[in-house]
């Protein structure tokens, strides 16, 4: 059974992940540039189901394309370069989902824009955090 200290650590990591995802979303929403149109044409894969930490595998698999799409935006929209930002997210995701079991992510048939993709994972973080508090 998870201890209160491990639950607290998980909660803090999820809150960190949530803040990073919200920061990216805010950066995109405040972004006024012709490249935004191009960014919004990229289709991300969405998880068929995202209710447990192991489902973060679906996010991990989309982090590389997320970085490359974010690269289109000028870095001034984000506190960190996309490369560093995604690297930070990757570290948190790996810790949260664990590496004990190899979970094969299942994707939904519909793809999503970067905004829809980020909102989906923001909702996921908020949902898990609420079950921990």
């Amino acid at each position: 059974a998870p201890t209160s200290s491990s639950t607290k650590k998980t909660q803090l990591q999820l809150e960190h992940l949530l803040l990073d995802l919200q920061m990216i979303l805010n950066g995109i929403n405040n972004y006024k540039n012709p490249k935004l149109t191009r960014m919004l044409t990229f289709k991300f894969y969405m998880p068929k189901k995202a209710t447990e930490l192991k489902h973060l595998q679906c996010l991990e698999e989309e982090l590389k394309p997320l970085e490359e799409v974010l690269n289109l935006a000028q870095s001034k929209n984000f506190h960190l370069r996309p490369r560093d930002l995604i690297s930070n997210i990757n570290v948190i995701v790996l810790e949260l989902k664990g590496s004990e079991t190899t979970f094969m992510c299942e994707y939904a048939d519909e793809t999503a824009t970067i905004v829809e993709f980020l909102n989906r994972w923001i909702t996921f973080c908020q949902s898990i955090i609420s079950t921990l508090t």
Epitope: R38, T41, F42, Y45, E61, P65, E68, L72, C105
Partner: antibody, heavy 118, light 107 residues
Framework: QVQLVQSGAEVKKPGASVKVSCKAS????????INWVRQATGQGLEWMGW????????GYAQKFQGRVTMTRNTSISTAYMELSSLRSEDTAVYYC???????????WGQGTLVTVSS | DIQMTQSPSSLSASVGDRVTITCRAS??????LGWYQQKPGKAPKRLIY???SLQSGVPSRFSGSGSGTEFTLTISSLQPEDFATYYC?????????FGQGTKVEIK
């Protein structure tokens, strides 16, 4: 890390066929198309076509239509390119490279030299 | 097919020089253009995608610009490891087509 590892060099006679493989690792194989690009010795790069590993759908450059077949085996994350009716002009290094929408040819295989000689 | 005309076909430069390579498309390709570097006996390596976005890990001395039919790759200060052949690629329409290449040699 993302890797595309291709099969070894081949020597073929004119009129024969060659099948080159490209094994993907470090990412979900079905999320990215596999493209094939060739390069004759001392020449430029020539795009041959693409294959979607998820659906198996393909698109070939007109120049290779009818002679090239791109397939895959998703269970072993491997793509294949078969070129038939080989002629000496087909002597080249053949590369596989992945792409997804407008993120094109970001990782490449090491290349496979195909020599066509009688 | 969309023709990509690259110029010059070769150039000689010294370490520290600013180098500019141009690619002209036979029709409007919007921003569906990338730049690749190839060294002898090696696979090409992507430097820039969507005209001006730098591939992760590529030094910032490389930059791309342009739109429509005219595109440029610039190396702000040439380094010894930059001596190679550079190709542009359009992926706006099938078949995708490469420029004929620009060989950057040591002066």
């Amino acid at each position: 890390q993302v890797q595309l590892v291709q099969s070894g060099a081949e020597v073929k006679k004119p009129g024969a066929s060659v099948k080159v493989s490209c094994k993907a690792s470090g990412y979900r194989f079905t999320s990215y198309d596999i493209n094939w690009v060739r390069q004759a010795t001392g020449q430029g790069l020539e795009w041959m076509g693409w294959m979607n590993p998820n659906s198996g759908n393909t698109g070939y450059a007109q120049k290779f239509q009818g002679r090239v077949t791109m397939t895959r085996n998703t269970s072993i994350s491997t793509a294949y390119m078969e070129l038939s009716s080989l002629r000496s002009e087909d002597t080249a290094v053949y590369y596989c490279a992945r792409s997804r929408q407008w993120l094109v040819l970001d990782y490449w295989g090491q290349g496979t030299l195909v020599t066509v000689s009688s | 097919d969309i023709q990509m005309t690259q110029s010059p076909s070769s150039l000689s430069a010294s370490v520290g020089d600013r180098v500019t390579i141009t690619c002209r498309a036979s029709q409007d390709i919007r921003d569906d253009l990338g730049w690749y570097q190839q060294k002898p006996g090696k696979a090409p390596k992507r430097l820039i995608y969507v005209v001006s976005s730098l591939q992760s890990g590529v030094p910032s001395r490389f930059s791309g610009s342009g739109s429509g039919t005219e595109f440029t790759l610039t190396i702000s200060s040439l380094q010894p490891e930059d001596f190679a052949t550079y190709y542009c690629l359009q992926h706006n329409g099938y078949p995708w087509t490469f420029g004929q290449g620009t060989k950057v040699e040591i002066k």
